[in-house]
């Protein structure tokens, strides 16, 4: 089961919904940016490979006071077997290199949306 | 209440793009998901694909080639072409409504036939 | 793909009876499964869903069981309006998938 319940979602729901619901968030994110998303932050970029979706929260959970991210970290958090805090960091991350947080929510959309199609839920 | 409403020429040539619409009352297609299912006479459901609350649409594999789902907000319609149509695309297409969060077809339109033939 | 086999495809019943249909998934899709029933030239209606829940205004002699791959609709005590083909569906991923059907006459 995937349990999002008390993040984003009413409760426990199948992994193809809570991608789905979490793909939603990041194209609502990309259509609604006006100015520089949490603006102009930059964070490291991840692999995007087995155990994104933890690389992905550790490198946003370091970007505070944007609430524009705060549903798209609940969200991920559901995802992540483990807890995150800030400052932690794992082998996935590509430590000399940092995009900003609206370039990164860009490439992670386009990769979820990929692992979407090809039925990749899990 | 949400009521869905679908429309569109009951008859449609082989090689041609059939081309339908779902009305949406008592709701806004600005939020959920807008799905399209169809019927073949005699036979089961086959699911079609989506469009989301956002716009963001997908497709069954087993049509992507051929299906476009798109939306007109200011009328609270989606739309629904196939294109090259043959005589196995014969069926009663349906337009039904999925919440967020869920993976179920709570409302359903009535549906409308169409028929591939020349 | 995950596939949806359904049984029986078709069965004969009387009113009153305890009707009970199966469905079956390639895979194991947890509880994540709908169940609907179709009358001649009408949309499917939801029944159940997450395999056991009612949806708003079913009547309690409808219920729903199983989890894994192996799924069950009972009807306690068929009634007039009660037959009817019914189909299973999973959510467990995309494309979403339905049973065949099962055709409930009049005995």
């Known amino acids: 089961l995937t349990c999002l319940g008390g993040f984003a979602s009413p409760g426990p729901v199948p992994p193809s919904t809570a991608l789905r619901e979490l793909i939603e968030e990041l194209v609502n994110i990309t259509q609604n940016q006006k100015a520089p998303l949490c603006n102009g932050s930059m964070v490291w970029s991840i692999n995007l490979t087995a155990g994104m979706y933890c690389a992905a929260l550790e490198s946003l959970i370091n970007v505070s006071g944007c609430s524009a991210i705060e549903k798209t970290q609940r969200m991920l958090s559901g995802f992540c077997p483990h807890k995150v805090s800030a400052g932690q960091f794992s082998s996935l991350h590509v430590r000399d290199t940092k995009i900003e947080v609206a370039q990164f929510v860009k490439d992670l959309l386009l990769h979820l949306k990929k692992l979407f199609r090809e039925g990749q839920f899990n | 209440e949400v009521q869905l409403q679908e429309s569109g020429p009951g008859l449609v040539k082989p090689s041609e793009t059939l081309s339908l619409t779902c009305t949406v009352s008592?709701?806004?297609?600005?939020?959920?998901?807008w799905n399209w299912i169809r019927q073949p006479p005699g036979k089961g459901l086959e699911y079609i694909g989506y469009?989301?609350?956002?716009?963001?649409?997908y497709y069954n594999p087993s049509l992507k080639s051929r299906v476009t789902i798109s939306r007109d907000t200011s009328k609270n319609q989606l739309s629904l072409k196939l294109s090259s149509v043959t005589a196995a695309d014969t069926a009663v297409y349906y337009c039904?409504?999925?919440?967020?969060?869920?993976?179920?077809?709570?409302?359903w339109g009535q549906g409308t036939t169409v028929t591939v033939s020349s | 793909d995950i596939q949806m086999t359904q049984s029986p495809s078709s069965l004969s019943a009387s009113v009153g009876d305890r009707v009970t249909i199966t469905c079956h998934a390639s895979?194991?899709?947890?509880?994540?499964l709908s169940w609907y029933q179709q009358k001649p030239g009408k949309a499917p209606k939801l029944l159940i869903y997450?395999?056991?829940d009612l949806h708003t205004g079913v009547p309690s002699r409808f219920s729903g069981s199983g989890s894994g791959t192996d799924f069950t609709l009972t009807i306690s005590s068929l009634q007039p309006e009660d037959f009817a083909t019914y189909y299973c569906q999973q959510g467990q991923s995309y494309p979403y998938t339905f049973g065949g059907g099962t055709k409930v006459e009049i005995k």
């Open positions: 039904a409504r999925l919440a967020k969060w869920t993976w179920y077809f709570d409302i």
């Open positions: 895979q194991n899709i947890n509880v994540w």
């Open positions: 997450k395999a056991s």
């Open positions: 008592g709701g806004s297609i600005s939020s959920d998901y």
């Open positions: 469009i989301s609350y956002n716009g963001n649409t």
